[in-house]
């Protein structure tokens, strides 16, 4: 997973005497916005699938009014980057379309008018994690300058963002069961270990050590059900103590969707479902035909030869909306069993299973001890997908093949000397100390200072100190 980022540096007239007239005037002030459409560069269906890798619409630029008699300068641009998140691997070779749109802010009936000022396209090779690449392209009398890059979202790394890696903890080798992240031999493959205690049913993680809750659950370990019955309004940030949703202002208040679009809340913001003939973040783009490529994510555009006739987008599997702009969250159905992490790859669902489980939906519970032998009389113990050997005295290691040195861990406290014995170890305590590990001081009058009850034992439980 990662993000493609596009930075527009300038949009203005190309050099030379034939500079275009400004797209804005005193009578018709306007502002610009940009649309980027990405697709895998070498896919055969690329032409028919305009935005299979994703698309993004910029914010509106500042309002610009032409100064009479002055040549068109570079036009004021929207702030920030255009970001296109990608869930799957970065393809390395990609195709792009960048469109410059003009929003006229005159006294049009029915809201602002839209027109496409310029469109540039190209195919490039780009490794994720690399530096910014800059491009300059002409479109008619206009010149567009932009930079782009692709970066991975941690813990994904590599030129395609397909490997989960972390820096090596030990200088010489990776931890048990972990392979080096070739070709980055100084990194190790990271096991996807959620925060300890994270609910396997209601929590999941996309990075080691985190615990993210499925809808309806809250708390640091996703063990607290969200109860809305005692709340004033089913909205707002969750209260950690009650698990109750505290009321707050809703992103759909006042309906930000124009042109009859309907608003629905999302975890971060809101989403507009636009009527046919409109698209954009707030359904503000209109007068669109199939020639404008309004269908995102590989949607097939039908009809709409002129601005007055509607078009229809036939969406590919995994996408919906009048412009195929919404990814169907098929993971919300929780298809992965036994705490597996659901990944919607667009073309397919994938379950990343927790250790000890397998199958397309993590439905198979693996027998960790099957075919595993513990040497030297050790017995196999199943545990969370990783078999473990409980070794007989005097042996250790993963399969009990190593002869254990019980004194290696220096178990005798307060200067006691350790002796290996057939039954384990024996501590010879220094003067003034006693106990199996020489852990208790002996009082000068000869009475021992044994605790009333060691931690974890109730008074009256059998206590063996020696």
């Amino acid at each position: 997973a990662g993000v493609f980022e596009l930075q527009i540096h300038s949009f203005g007239p190309g050099p030379g005497p034939g500079a275009p007239r400004s797209p804005c005037s005193a009578r018709l002030p306007c502002r610009l916005f940009f649309r980027v459409c990405l697709k895998p560069g070498l896919s055969e269906e690329a032409a028919e699938s305009p935005c299979a890798l994703g698309a993004a619409l910029s914010a509106r630029g500042p309002v610009y009014t032409e100064q009479p008699g002055a040549p068109a300068p570079d036009l004021p641009l929207p702030d920030g980057l255009l970001q296109v998140p990608f869930r799957d691997a970065w393809p390395g070779t990609f195709s792009f379309i960048i469109e410059t749109w003009r929003e006229e802010l005159g006294d049009q009936i029915g809201g602002p008018a839209w027109s496409l000022l310029a469109r540039v396209a190209g195919r490039r090779r780009l490794a994720a994690g690399g530096p910014w690449a800059r491009d300059i392209q002409r479109a008619g009398a206009w010149e567009l300058r932009f930079s782009y890059r692709a970066r991975c979202e941690p813990p994904a790394v590599g030129t395609a963002c397909t490997r989960l890696c972390r820096p090596r903890s030990a200088p010489s080798r990776c931890g048990p069961g972990l392979r080096p992240c070739a070709p980055l031999e100084d990194e190790c493959e990271a096991p996807l270990v959620c925060r300890a205690g994270c609910s396997p049913e209601h929590g999941f993680c996309e990075q080691p050590g985190e615990c993210r809750c499925l809808e309806g659950w809250t708390g640091p370990l996703c063990t607290v059900p969200v109860s809305t019955s005692s709340c004033l309004s089913p909205r707002g940030p969750s209260s950690a103590t009650t698990g109750c949703l505290v009321p707050g202002p809703g992103p759909c208040d006042g309906n930000p969707c124009a042109n009859g679009g309907s608003c629905s809340e999302t975890p971060r913001s809101f989403e507009c479902t636009c009527p046919r003939g409109f698209y954009g973040l707030r359904c503000e783009v209109s007068g669109v035909t199939c020639a404008d490529g309004p269908c995102f994510n590989g949607g097939l555009c039908v009809g709409g030869a002129d601005p007055d006739s509607a078009y229809i987008c036939h969406c590919p599997p995994g996408f919906q909306g009048s412009n195929c702009e919404k990814r169907v969250d098929r993971c919300s159905l929780q298809p992965c069993r036994n705490g597996g992490l659901c990944l919607d790859l667009g073309h397919a669902l994938r379950c990343r299973c927790r250790a000890g489980f397998a199958g397309p939906r993590c439905e198979h519970d693996l027998d960790d001890c099957a075919g595993r032998a513990c040497a030297n009389g050790g017995t196999c113990v199943e545990g969370g997908g990783a078999h473990r050997c409980s070794c007989a005295l005097g042996f250790g290691g993963r399969d009990c093949r190593e002869r254990a040195d019980p004194c290696a861990a220096r178990p005798c406290a307060h200067g006691g000397r350790c002796y290996a014995h057939f039954s384990g170890l024996v501590c010879a305590c220094a003067p003034g100390y006693m106990g199996a590990r020489c852990e208790f001081p002996v009082h000068p009058d000869g009475a021992s200072a044994l605790p009333a009850a060691p931690p974890g034992l109730r008074p009256g439980d059998p206590q063996r100190y020696l």
């Epitope: 560069g41 800059r134 008619g140 010149e143």
Partner: antibody, heavy 117, light 107 residues
Framework: EVQLQQSGPELEKPGASVKISCKAS????????MNWVKQSNGKSLEWIGN????????SYKQKFEGKATLTVDKSSSTAYMQLKSLTSEDSAVYYC??????????WGQGTTLTVSS | DIQMTQSPASLAASVGETVTITCRAS??????LAWYQQKQGKSPQLLIY???SLEDGVPSRFSGSGSGTQYSMKINSMQPEDTATYFC?????????FGAGTKLELK
């Protein structure tokens, strides 16, 4: 007036290296990429690669990777192309050309390289 | 790499005649095509970009058209100063690639 002034003709022996320069004037040097193009004995044109003087990033046609190295000196608004391990196949006219990816609007006058023992 | 096939390799035309040069790409290049003119002993000069946009200062008798993989450049009324070699160049994908050229002579 935009101008790209290239260095003079070069005669080199096989195995040697050569560095051709292209001095830009009349525009903001970091505002456009600098492309390099090879033309062998008056025949077709072949794109070698380009360099972005702003970020310093460069891109090459695969066959010229290891053969050509593109650099810039922003302080003097000059682009350079170094060709190494020269053979007779490298004998050609080399052009620098200002532009973006879909236009080369100004070209240098060309530098003739002759590789001969 | 995208291959550009240019035709004809050479042709001769009389003053006032209409000349058409064509260029075929090995795959769809989405209008990303430029045309250059190179006169004998000179550097190439940009005529047309984005398949049909005329560069500043280029006479209006030059025009470009086409889409997909097929593109052409037309000189509406041949003039003596149009004697040159013409190259097409695809700008859709890196590496940028040129056609082999068309040598246009005065008849």
């Amino acid at each position: 007036e935009v101008q790209l002034q290239q260095s003079g003709p070069e005669l080199e022996k096989p195995g040697a290296s050569v560095k051709i320069s292209c001095k830009a004037s009349g525009y903001s040097f970091t505002g456009y990429n600098m492309n390099w193009v090879k033309q062998s004995n008056g025949k077709s044109l072949e794109w070698i690669g380009n360099i972005d003087p702003y970020y310093g990033g460069s891109s090459y046609k695969q066959k010229f990777e290891g053969k050509a190295t593109l650099t810039v000196d922003k302080s003097s608004s000059t682009a350079y192309m170094q060709l190494k391990s020269l053979t007779s196949e490298d004998s050609a006219v080399y052009y620098c050309a200002r532009g973006g990816s879909n236009f080369f609007d100004y070209w240098g006058q060309g530098t003739t390289l002759t590789v001969s023992s | 790499d995208i291959q550009m096939t240019q035709s004809p390799a050479s042709l001769a035309a009389s003053v006032g005649e209409t000349v058409t040069i064509t260029c075929r790409a090995s795959e769809n290049i989405y209008y990303s095509l430029a045309w250059y003119q190179q006169k004998q002993g000179k550097s190439p000069q940009l005529l047309i970009y984005n398949a049909n946009s005329l560069e500043d200062g280029v006479p209006s008798r030059f025009s470009g058209s086409g889409s997909g993989t097929q593109y052409s450049m037309k000189i509406n009324s041949m003039q003596p100063e149009d004697t040159a070699t013409y190259f097409c160049k695809q700008t859709y994908d890196v590496p940028l690639t040129f056609g082999a050229g068309t040598k246009l002579e005065l008849k």
